[in-house]
Interface confidence: low
Amino acid sequence: APVRSLHCTLRDAQLKSLVMSGPYELKALHLQGQDLEQQVVFSMSFVQGEESNDKIPVALGLKAKNLYLSCVLKDDKPTLQLESVDPKNYPKKKMEKRFVFNKIEINNKLEFESAQFPNWYISTSQAENMPVFLGGTRGGQDITDFTMQFVSS
């Protein structure tokens, strides 16, 4: 069966939206009105992985682009990147682990934990216009909580 996917946008707990910044980078900033057209639409695919009531493995691709968020080691540090893939082969049910995030729902907020690097989360800075990154702390200054808005396909 084909992998189940939905289209959505994400905003962090400060209501910052995610937009492209260059070809392989996302940043978070406050958008309103017409500017919201700049935000990234994700294709969230439900993939194979450890699943529980509040933890669902997903892959986060960019809608209509052959780019997926992935987690890799750079300079010995878990790092978030946008990675190009062959659109003929993706998305797929059994995604490589670097593409997989555990979508965790807590108090109507979502966290995205790297399956490759447990306890590392998709994060944004408090500051405006800063890159989206993989952070190793929750509940600190950096933001790891998101809300999801469904987008009709």
Epitope: S21, P23, H30, L31, Q32, G33, Q34, E37, T79, P131
Partner: antibody
């Protein structure tokens, strides 16, 4: 060809007001953030204000905050700077500048020729 | 505000010779997450508007001759011109884009 043409500069007394305009052509104006940058006579460059594509994110330098208002009309391909409570130190050439959004914020890739504002009694 | 300091302020150069301009920032412009330095260089030729030469400290803007190169990281940056030509005369500005933009005071390059 990208073109940015400023107008509206002139001589004004301290405490007075001016409205600068910038007519943009040669690119899809509504897809780019825009700036005003100024240059006092014989001095260096000073960033003044930034406005995002749909006017919903605006930033100002501390030196003009509360006195200047940046705005845009995408239907008219135009950028504006309303300057109130003008001071002697606002005397400068004011440049309309395009922001290269895809590179990184505040990377200014095209500049107009500038319009001169002189504040003097 | 991040303060940008350029040296020298005046730079007389013989055509064909190299030239180097230094720019120091009051805080690091290196974003450890993107591993990019948010620094740009501009040239303002006499009587003209500024033009973008370099961004991200070392990436040349399209159309900029390859005799221009940018280097450095953190707080110390350099713009080099491998062989100065008469058309390179003008004022060179560094500018940080890590925060709301601030420019250096400018370096005036003139031909000896």
């Amino acid at each position: 060809e990208v073109q940015l043409v400023e107008s509206g500069g002139g001589l004004v007394q301290p405490g007075g007001s001016l409205r600068l305009s910038c007519a943009a052509s040669g690119f899809t104006f509504s897809s780019f953030g825009m700036h005003w940058v100024r240059q006092a006579p014989g001095k260096g460059l000073e960033w003044v204000a930034y406005i995002s594509i749909g006017s919903y994110t605006v930033h100002y330098a501390d030196s003009v905050k509360g006195r200047f208002t940046i705005s845009r009309d995408n239907a008219k391909n135009s950028l504006y700077l309303q300057m109130n409570s003008l001071r002697d130190e606002d005397t400068a050439v004011y440049y309309c500048v395009r922001d290269d959004y895809d590179v990184t914020d505040y990377t200014m890739d095209y500049w107009g020729q500038g319009t001169t504002v002189t504040v003097s009694s | 505000d991040i303060v940008m300091t350029q040296t020298p302020l005046s730079l007389p150069v013989t055509p064909g010779e190299p030239a180097s301009i230094s720019c120091k920032s009051s805080q690091s412009l290196l974003n450890s997450r993107t591993r990019k330095n948010y620094l740009a260089w501009y040239l303002q030729k006499p009587g003209q508007s500024p033009q973008l030469l370099i961004y991200w400290a070392s990436t040349r803007e399209s159309g900029v001759p390859d005799r221009f190169s940018g280097s450095g990281s953190g707080t110390d940056f350099t713009l080099k011109i491998s062989r100065v030509e008469a058309e390179d005369v003008g004022v060179y500005y560094c500018k940080q884009t890590y925060n709301f933009p601030t420019f250096g005071q400018g370096t005036k390059l003139e031909i000896k």
